[in-house]
């Protein structure tokens, strides 16, 4: 089940998915002046079985100005991931995200890709938030958001993160990149009488205004 909305935005914060659930799609987009090769994939798809997940298809871009006689070949995502994890593996790296059951890691760059990547997330996807450079977490609970299905509708949980200017006192001076966990923290969702938040109002408005598949874009 695809998530209908974008993850929530937080002032002076940025989010990333550290690993992508099976079923996630990534559009194959090229930057200006380039286009997908003829017969090239429209998207990459995170697929797999219980023991291993990887991106199906590969994105390839070629110059719009030239005839498509020679393909610009980009290594298979699987091949790239292999290179990433075996060539001088850093001892300080967290557990390889690809080892999470049912998850793919961030696909490596491909030549002349678009600046923004457009992902289609699925229910259960988690994204992690950090304050951008120059800002610090002043007060926070879980700094992540999970796409959940509640009463037949998808919604993203609200991350508890406030980012403030560097000069102000920070209760959380040390922030580290979280290791992706397969599922979000369990939340009590036994009742349908959920308090309506600003975020819920915004997402419900967005959902009613949406006429086509909602795409999630981030750099």
């Amino acid at each position: 089940e695809l998530c209908d909305d974008d993850p929530p935005e937080i002032p002076h914060a940025t989010f990333k998915a550290m690993a992508y659930k099976e079923g996630t799609m990534l559009n194959c987009e090229c930057k200006r002046g380039f286009r997908r090769i003829k017969s090239g994939s429209l998207y990459m798809l995170c697929t797999g079985n219980s023991s291993h997940s990887s991106w199906d298809n590969q994105c390839q871009c070629t110059s719009s100005a030239t005839r498509n006689t020679t393909k610009q070949v980009t290594p298979q995502p699987e091949e790239q991931k292999e290179r990433k994890t075996t060539e001088m593996q850093s001892p300080m790296q967290p557990v390889d995200q690809a080892s999470l059951p049912g998850h793919c890691r961030e696909p490596p760059p491909w030549e002349n890709e678009a600046t923004e990547r457009i992902y289609h997330f699925v229910v259960g996807q988690m994204v992690y938030y950090q304050c951008v450079q120059g800002y610090r977490a002043l007060h926070r609970g879980p700094a992540e958001s999970v796409c959940k299905m509640t009463h037949g509708k998808t919604r993203w949980t609200q991350p508890q993160l406030i980012c403030t200017g560097e000069m102000e006192t920070s209760q959380f001076p040390g922030e580290e990149k979280p290791q992706a966990s397969p599922e979000g923290r369990p939340e009590s969702e036994t009742s349908c009488l959920v308090t309506t938040t600003d975020f819920q109002i915004q997402t419900e408005m967005a959902a009613t205004m949406e006429t086509s598949i909602f795409t999630t874009e981030y750099q």
Epitope: E9, K16, P94, P109, V132, K177, Q219
Partner: nanobody
Framework: QLQLVESGGGLVQAGGSLRLSCTAS????????IGWFRQAPGKEREGVSY????????YYIDSVKGRFTISSDFAKSTVYLQMNNLKPEDTAVYYC???????????????????????WGKGTLVTVSS
């Protein structure tokens, strides 16, 4: 195939300078943080510096602040690390790396410090003799 190619390493005396280059032809720099890690023999790899392709914000590990400067020439698909006043403790293999930016082109230095990058170069050796 998209690769990161480092150059500029070598042997230099303490107090000297070197400029490392990392070329990534075909990389859409605007979507990435690009920069340098280093690994000294028997030590963990550490994130030295990066520059973001979205707004050119920079980061440096404390031990190189004021001595190293990162810059970019995206027209040449290249990022540079100017290293001045080198010390013996800067001796290491220096690796170029890229990491995808977060939403709205934002980036957090903790992501770089984690060392979980999307693509690595093969490295260039820098040796500083005393």
């Amino acid at each position: 195939q998209l690769q990161l190619v480092e150059s500029g390493g070598g042997l230099v005396q303490a107090g000297g300078s070197l400029r490392l280059s990392c070329t990534a032809s075909g990389l859409t720099f605007e979507g990435y943080a690009i920069g340098w890690f280093r690994q000294a023999p028997g030590k963990e790899r550490e994130g030295v510096s990066y520059i973001t392709g979205s707004d050119a914000s920079t980061y440096y590990i404390d031990s190189v602040k004021g001595r190293f400067t990162i810059s970019s020439d995206f027209a040449k698909s290249t990022v540079y690390l100017q290293m001045n006043n080198l010390k013996p403790e800067d001796t290491a293999v220096y690796y170029c790396a890229v990491d995808r930016l977060g939403s709205r082109g934002g980036y957090a230095s903790s992501w770089w410090r984690s060392g979980d990058m999307d693509l690595w170069g093969k490295g260039t050796l820098v040796t500083v003799s005393s």
